[in-house]
Amino acid sequence: LRKVAHLTGKSNSRSMPLEWEDTYGIVLLSGVKYKKGGLVINETGLYFVYSKVYFRGQSCNNLPLSHKVYMRNSKYPQDLVMMEGKMMSYCTTGQMWARSSYLGAVFNLTSADHLYVNVSELSLVNFEESQTFFGLYKL
Amino acid sequence: LRKVAHLTGKSNSRSMPLEWEDTYGIVLLSGVKYKKGGLVINETGLYFVYSKVYFRGQSCNNLPLSHKVYMRNSKYPQDLVMMEGKMMSYCTTGQMWARSSYLGAVFNLTSADHLYVNVSELSLVNFEESQTFFGLYKL
Amino acid sequence: LRKVAHLTGKSNSRSMPLEWEDTYGIVLLSGVKYKKGGLVINETGLYFVYSKVYFRGQSCNNLPLSHKVYMRNSKYPQDLVMMEGKMMSYCTTGQMWARSSYLGAVFNLTSADHLYVNVSELSLVNFEESQTFFGLYKL
């Protein structure tokens, strides 16, 4: 079976890393486990990993935004940032605003690697399933 | 044969969903049909679907922009929005502006699904083949 | 072996096309050669090609930004722009700013094709490995 995941935004996320909807809607989860916000790799190999986050706010104050996909493995002491997007000075002060960040690339992942998504400002994330998501597939 | 498509912007299009160049240039279409703006799936399975739209204008008024990839199937009464990007308050009033929206993710598609791209304002789309495109491939 | 590459930003790039880190960090290079900024295809076929560039500056002057993935082959006299992103009027004058451009799509590539990334303003690119990268894999 193809190892694949597509998880969508979960609006009751209250902490980092982001948590994801892994059951309902346009979700996919096959040959990969989901655990506390993370996708857990169970077979070493090459994977295309992607994420999109939709940020929006009622009144722009240009708070710096970041969106990271990072990896954690018990063998390593520190998280490894695989992909990252940052935004600064992106909207007109006081206006309602909206913007997305998209990341996607190929990585060599090892069994037991845990992949997560982090954002700098949770209150500015909109969790609609079509707008904010996290996925991967084994090549 | 690998099921794959890469369609590029078609500039004399006035209709929604967007219409695409399916013959000339850097276009690919193999094992998937193109019909009236849509990519028609003929084999159930996992697909990576992507689209990029290039918006630009002579004088910024921050018209809200949206870019959607959606799916239609005669078995379902309503379109399903698979991926979406929105932009608000993204340029300086009165200035010439340009911005792209990129979407890409994995979906489980069924034979006879039709995939389309929609934008909120067609007049602001630039259809250069390198800038605006729509594609997929079967994993 | 799977033909795959993921190259990351190299901060001593001084000219176009961009040069890339092909040895250290989260780099992948298998079944594809790297030569003077370019990924060299050695087997004809379908490839998913992607790139992300992270632009940032101390004081916004809205210099137009472009990010291109292009192809060169000795059989053709001219470069072919495969994908391109442009940004104009994207930040507030005088402010510190940051923005990313992401490109990714499927192409039919031929043995001896050379793929490169070009940007309009090298001094505004940040080369962190998680932020600026270039990759592909054979479907």
Partner: antibody, heavy 119, light 111 residues
Framework: QVQLVQSGAEVKKPGSSVKVSCKAS????????ISWVRQAPGQGLEWMGW????????QYNENFKGRVTLTTDKSTSTAYMELSSLRSEDTAVYFC????????????WGQGTLVTVSS | EIVMTQSPATLSVSPGERATLSCRAS??????????IHWYQQKPGQAPRLLIY???HLESGIPARFSGSGSGTEFTLTISSLQSEDFAVYYC?????????FGQGTKVEIK
């Protein structure tokens, strides 16, 4: 900057036709609709139809179907509105307006052309 | 066709005061994304000028004292503090379907 410049005032006999021109500049003519709106003396605004210069497609208000014809000349970035079988109630100022395709708001207007229908 | 009804027909306001103009559509002009209603200002002998688009978005170059709100069938144009140059006729227009139709207009005059 975007400009729409219309042809001058016309006086026409009942039963005849009138053709008003609208020359566009300052933007890509083939990417936006041109709509035509008329305003009878002391009255409100009435939308007549739109044309898309990109492919020449058009749509008309049923109230004018069969009497109005919208055309464009891409080489000169000019739109035309021809109204036939004129009657006295067609006396009005006729405006062309640039219209965004999807949002269909009229963001730039011509100065207007007064058409008087009188015997 | 969608009928647009504006009220009042005439609004008498003193300079510096707030003006509130209403526009009602005979059926909803909103989708999940946008409300397809636009507001224009017209002065005697001039073409209309776009003020507000998609119910609440200020057109570039229009002063911030103009604002729009509403969804579905009920919409409002507000001028927070009337200036002398704001005395004019105001029209709402929908673009939800064909034909595009305008309201009959509200004349804002000096009290």
């Amino acid at each position: 900057q975007v400009q729409l410049v219309q042809s001058g005032a016309e006086v026409k006999k009942p039963g005849s036709s009138v053709k008003v021109s609208c020359k566009a500049s300052g933007y890509t003519f083939t990417r936006f609709d041109i709509s035509w709106v008329r305003q009878a003396p002391g009255q409100g605004l009435e939308w007549m139809g739109w044309i898309f210069p990109g492919d020449g497609s058009s749509q008309y208000n049923e109230n004018f179907k069969g009497r109005v014809t919208l055309t464009t000349d891409k080489s000169t970035s000019t739109a035309y509105m021809e109204l036939s079988s004129l009657r006295s109630e067609d006396t009005a100022v006729y405006f062309c307006a640039r219209s965004l395709i999807s949002t269909a708001m009229f963001d730039h207007w011509g100065q207007g052309t007064l058409v008087t229908v009188s015997s | 066709e969608i009928v647009m009804t504006q009220s009042p027909a005439t609004l008498s306001v003193s300079p510096g005061e707030r003006a509130t103009l209403s526009c009602r559509a005979s059926k909803s002009v909103s989708t999940s994304d946008f409300s397809y209603i636009h507001w224009y200002q017209q002065k005697p002998g001039q073409a209309p000028r776009l003020l507000i688009y998609l119910a609440s978005h200020l057109e570039s170059g229009i002063p911030a004292r103009f604002s729009g709100s509403g969804s579905g069938t009920e919409f409002t144009l507000t001028i927070s503090s009337l200036q002398s140059e704001d005395f004019a006729v105001y029209y709402c227009q929908h673009s939800r379907e064909l034909p595009r139709t305008f309201g009959q207009g509200t004349k804002v005059e000096i009290k």
